[in-house]
Amino acid sequence: EEELQVIQPDKSVLVAAGETATLRCTATSLIPVGPIQWFRGAGPGRELIYNQKEGHFPRVTTVSDLTKRNNMDFSIRIGNITPADAGTYYCVKFRKGSPDDVEFKSGAGTELSVRAKPSAPVVSGPAARATPQHTVSFTCESHGFSPRDITLKWFKNGNELSDFQTNVDPVGESVSYSIHSTAKVVLTREDVHSQVICEVAHVTLQGDPLRGTANLSETIRVPPTLEVTQQPVRAENQVNVTCQVRKFYPQRLQLTWLENGNVSRTETASTVTENKDGTYNWMSWLLVNVSAHRDDVKLTCQVEHDGQPAVSKSHDLKVSAHPKEQGSNTAAENTGSNERNIY
């Protein structure tokens, strides 16, 4: 009679993570008597996957009933496959022996490859805000995919970026892989509404790439421009001075009026107006009673934006241009929450 052969018909099997892998194995003869065992790997360091004689195998089931006397099908199914299950599986026939069964014949092996989807890309930006014209770095990470081949692209508002570096780890063979990419982005004043997108394409995604996004509103700081102007006389001996704070982001802003270097009033930007580009404008004003001053008055609008060092703009009020009237050196009434009289 022809000697028993162990047939593993599939050289390789490809399974998606979470699915069930079927590893096929048949024997050509019932003789010699003895059990079948399945191993992952070869040699002394192999891992025992299934033992016909004994053991507990929560994820492994046999395709046919191995207790049947004439059974020659030793195929197994492994459920809930993960990338860690990848490897070459050998179906091995043992000959009954005493005290131990003796390995008799091995199949040629079936390589199990596991396709695992990458995790959703996570994009993170710099810890501190940066101003326009500065270059900032964004990182994108995705993990747990297999096989190793993967494509990563960066976009800013739909436009593909080219200044980035990508690494896939580990370099050698592994059950699953991770990708890490760093992109450099130059900020512009119009970037409050901009988005940076990291796009990952992998064979497991069937042409529907995964995307991670970061809003530049969390990264950018647009410093304000200041303009101090003197409005036409509102009433006799009164001048309205306004400080226009334009095109700033984020909204956090504190304004202080100084009269000849002395603090007159401090206020926090509240009712701002939003520009189309996402930046904000705000205006503060002072009502100045010029008749109370003998000398010129230096008015300074000082703005502290988003915790940054203060910027300021000054305006000189020429008192001599307004002839004094008798009895007009009393304080004028405040006519609004943003108004202040100097006296």
Epitope: L48, I49, F57, D85
Partner: nanobody
Framework: QVQLQESGGGVVQAGDSLRLSCVAS????????MGWFRQAPGKEREFVAG????????YYADSMKGRFTISRDNAKNLVYLQMNSLKPEDTAVYYC?????????????????WGQGTQVTVSS
Amino acid sequence: QVQLQESGGGVVQAGDSLRLSCVASGRTFSSLDMGWFRQAPGKEREFVAGISRSGISQYYADSMKGRFTISRDNAKNLVYLQMNSLKPEDTAVYYCAAALTFRGSDLPRDSNYWGQGTQVTVSS
């Protein structure tokens, strides 16, 4: 060289549960098959349970099947033995063992490394 350190032993009442842990260091944990053994006073060391390196296959001594569960966490280099419905006859020193090769309940013969053991006492 592999270092093994057991923990989780103690004194419990019959019918109670206990979970033993064993942390391994000194070698790639996922390349080791792991097992638990026990030795009661005046008796030989006996096999309790074994688990293959990926955790896919597990083996139990007949007297512990259904009551004891072996598991492992390769990310943390840990192997566990969950013991339920404990009996006074489960009183023993429990040892963790690591093997470079694994053949089911042949594990005692194949174990290359042993821990110091943790005492489990089950009172009636």
